[in-house]
Structure formats: C-alpha cells, structure tokens
Amino acid sequence: VLPRWRQQWSGSGTTSRFPETVLARCVKYTEVHPEMRHVDCQSVWDAFKGAFISKYPCNITEEDYQPLVKLGTQTVPCNKTLLWSRIKDLAHQFTQVQRDMFTLEDMLLGYLADDLTWCGEFNTFEINYQSCPDWRKDCSNNPVSVFWKTVSRRFAETACGVVHVMLNGSRSKIFDKNSTFGSVEVHNLQPEKVQALEAWVIHGGREDSRDLCQDPTIKELESIISKRNIRFFCKNIYRPDKFLQCVKNPEDSSCLSGI
C-alpha cells in the first residue's frame, strides 16, 4: 500500500514522542507545584491536541488554543514576572536560583512546550513527524508560533507590579521589536496593573564596560513603554556569572560591589 501523500514543510517535524513528552512533563510539573496537584493532565493534553490536530497547520489561530489556555490558568505574584528576549538560558538559570520569580517556561503551559515542535494535518488525526511549517519559509500562523504568541500575550496581560526583562547585550539589536517580547509582551503589559518595567541588559564580554542602557534600541523600548504610561528602568549586568553567583549567595563580600 502506498503511503498517503503528506504535505512537505520547510521546518523540522514534530518532536518524537510528543504526546508522551507533554503528558510526562505535565505530571512532573503537577508533582513539583503543590498548587497544581489536582490538575488532570489527560484533560490538558486533550486540550493541547485539540488546538492543532486535524487542522491545516498554516491556519492556526489563538482561538484554537483558548481551551488549553483556560486549563493552564496560573497567577504569578506581583513583582515576580521575568520576561526575556534572546537570552533564555540565563533567564532560566536565574529563576532556578531565585525560586520566587517566574519566566513563562516556569509556568505549566510554557514548561510543557519548551523546545518542542508540533503540527498536525488537515482532516486526519495524525501528528506530522516528518515536517512542520517554518515561520519564515512557510507561514507564521503555524501551531508552534501561534502557541507562543498566545501564551506570551496571556503571560504579559496577567503581570503586575514591577515587571523585569532580561535582554541580551551582545546582540546588534538589544531590544528587537520583532521578537516575542517586542511584538507581543511589551504591548500587552497592562498599565493599570504594571507600575514599571525594569530591563536588565546582560553584557557578553568580560571587559565590556559600556553603558548599554544608552543603546538606541533601549531608548526605543523606553519610549514605547513610557507612551503606555509604564515607568521604565534599566540596569547593566556587566558580569552575568557573578550576577548568578550573587543571587545564590547574596552575603558574599564580592557581591557588595557592582555586577
């Protein structure tokens, strides 16, 4: 029997063992987070699956993910939201040490999908493990991109107090309007709830002593934020390694000087 014709996309296919991975991650998450221990992971997986299975993978909408978003509702305490752009690893290392702060990937839905790829096919119940749409080469309304746009919007909408964002000072555009942070999160912070956005610009080079808070793209971010009636602050983190070390051991004498 000839295999049924399958759409060829430019991106890599669904991560192997995707359903098992999502379910296992959900169970692990509910075990580690007491406030989530009553969550039915099968229902979460069913809602996740329902967002993209049997649907044309270039025509996914935020509406498709609403049942999942409803099931994944969580609140972050005020002043405890950490956004990031192009510096995921350090942001995650930070929240692993500073346990009372949270990135999107520390929340159930972000944790489930982190580093995974998925897509289905129109009119079949199959998951496509061969290829999935690439954001640039195929379409932006693909299951993965729409998921992150949806959950990022929700994460930003629910933030309150002082929100922090970690930015990569080694990139040509420290603040990139086309990143998820620049295109989604910045515009969905609620001025009624968010008093300020504090940017932490992470330096790459050991001898880099420039004030990257004066970078034109940071000034652009400040302008966007200020126009939204949210105060803006910026800090240089000259030594990310020392920064993490001082989060772990704030009493260390070397932590009294600048980082």
Partner: antibody, heavy 119, light 110 residues
Framework: EVQLLESGGGLVPPGGSLRLSCAAS????????MSWVRQAPGKGLEWVST??????????YSADSVKGRFTISRDDSKNTLYLQMNSLRAEDTAVYYC??????????WGQGTTVTVSS | QSVLTQPPSASGTPGQRVTISCSGT????????VHWYQQFPGTAPKLLIY???QRPSGVPDRFSGSKSGTSASLAISGLQSEDEADYYC???????????FGGGTKLTVL
C-alpha cells in the same frame, strides 16, 4: 491500617466556639494533606477546609462560608488535625468528617463527630 | 457555595446498568480530576472512583468512571441491591481554591 478518629463535637449555643480534633494513625501524617468536610442533617457533603503538608508550605484553604470563623491547623508531632470553630451559627450544625489525601484526592475518611449549634 | 450538578435521584432494577452524571465548569471538572464517593445512611463516605476512572482495591469492576470536558459520569453495571446508597462526585475548584461536591444522587434499586 489507616485510621482517623474525630472528637470534640457537641452542643454549643450560637456565637460559641468548639475545637475539633482528628487523631491519625497508620500512615505518615507529616506528608499528608488533610481536610475537613461536613454534612448537615439530611443534606449533601460540603467541604470546609484543607491544609497542605508542611513540606508543601502548610497552606490552609477554607470555604467562603467559614472564612474568618474556622481555622484549620495541624500538629505533626501529635499526628493530629484540628478545626477551631468560632462564632458558630445554626447552619454550622453537621457531622464533621476528617479526611486524608492520597496525593490529590481524599481517600480515607473518619467516622465523623457531630456538632449541634442551638440555644 | 456552588456545587457540581448531579441528578438528585436515580433508579434501576437488579442487573441493569445505571449512569449518574456530574457537570461542572472549566475551573473544576474541566481542569482537575473527578472523584466519586459512596455513602450509606449513618456512615462515612467511602472512595469509589478516583482520578476520573481509577478504582481503589476492593471496589468491584461493576463501577466505572469517565470524564469528558466539564462533565463526568459514574456507571454501575449489573446493579445489585447493596448498591443502594448516596453517590457524590467531587473535584477541586481552582477559582475557589477548594473542593466542590455534587449535591448527591440517591440510588434506589427497585
């Protein structure tokens, strides 16, 4: 064998106070989340309070109907769960059950203790 | 305090199959596990089904549970006279941060 034994019920006038106890045995009490559930005469089950294990923060939760009046607490050294009930009302009249969690559901219930609020 | 919705009564003849429904919302049944309890008059509730469909040891396989969306159901096949009791569904509600019980269903074996 897992056992939960409630005590402390009785007749109390409106506005009065009572402290219920639940003595636990046959399982590691320290690790268990615990709940109080009540049942008014001829009515259904109504959740009253839940308390997490200390390792999970010891957080207490209570139904809106008892918030500010009832306090759930635990003494892990005595394997005992408590429910301090103040400002009692006629509608608090019920059999009060203590129940233990098995991770995310209440699997074992005590036989209950009767609280009657009447003048 | 809101409750999960159950029919107040159900009945069947010995050998029959009876189903008891339990409906809620996204913040309880939709998102969280459903558990079922059996209670005979004057006694404490006893766990019958946990996590939607699991049976504790000692519970006959005539009892089964299922869940779909924001509803759950308890099925009893091969009904026996000793099944005459009150049945309650329960689920944690994330909006209330507490347990919700169904109003209870009184099962009569005719």
């Amino acid at each position: 064998e897992v056992q939960l034994l409630e005590s402390g019920g009785g007749l109390v006038p409106p506005g009065g106070s009572l402290r219920l106890s639940c003595a636990a045995s046959g399982f590691t009490f320290t690790n268990a989340w615990m709940s109080w559930v009540r049942q008014a005469p001829g009515k259904g089950l109504e959740w009253v309070s839940t308390i997490r294990s200390k390792t999970d923060g010891g957080t207490p939760y209570s139904a809106d109907s008892v918030k500010g009046r009832f306090t759930i607490s635990r003494d892990d050294s005595k394997n005992t769960l408590y429910l301090q009930m103040n400002s009692l009302r006629a509608e608090d009249t019920a059999v009060y059950y203590c129940a233990k969690y098995d991770y995310n559901y209440m699997d074992v219930w005590g036989q209950g203790t009767t609280v009657t609020v009447s003048s | 305090q809101s409750v999960l919705t159950q029919p107040p009564s159900a009945s069947g003849t010995p050998g029959q199959r009876v189903t008891i429904s339990c409906s809620g919302t996204t913040s309880n049944i939709g998102r969280n596990y459903v558990h079922w309890y059996q209670q005979f008059p004057g006694t404490a509730p006893k766990l019958l089904i946990y996590r939607n469909s699991q049976r504790p040891s000692g519970v006959p396989d005539r009892f089964s549970g299922s869940k779909s969306g924001t509803s759950a159901s308890l099925a009893i096949s091969g009904l026996q006279s000793e099944d005459e009791a009150d049945y309650y569904c329960a689920a944690w509600d994330d909006s209330l941060n507490g347990w919700l019980f169904g109003g209870g269903t009184k099962l009569t074996v005719l």
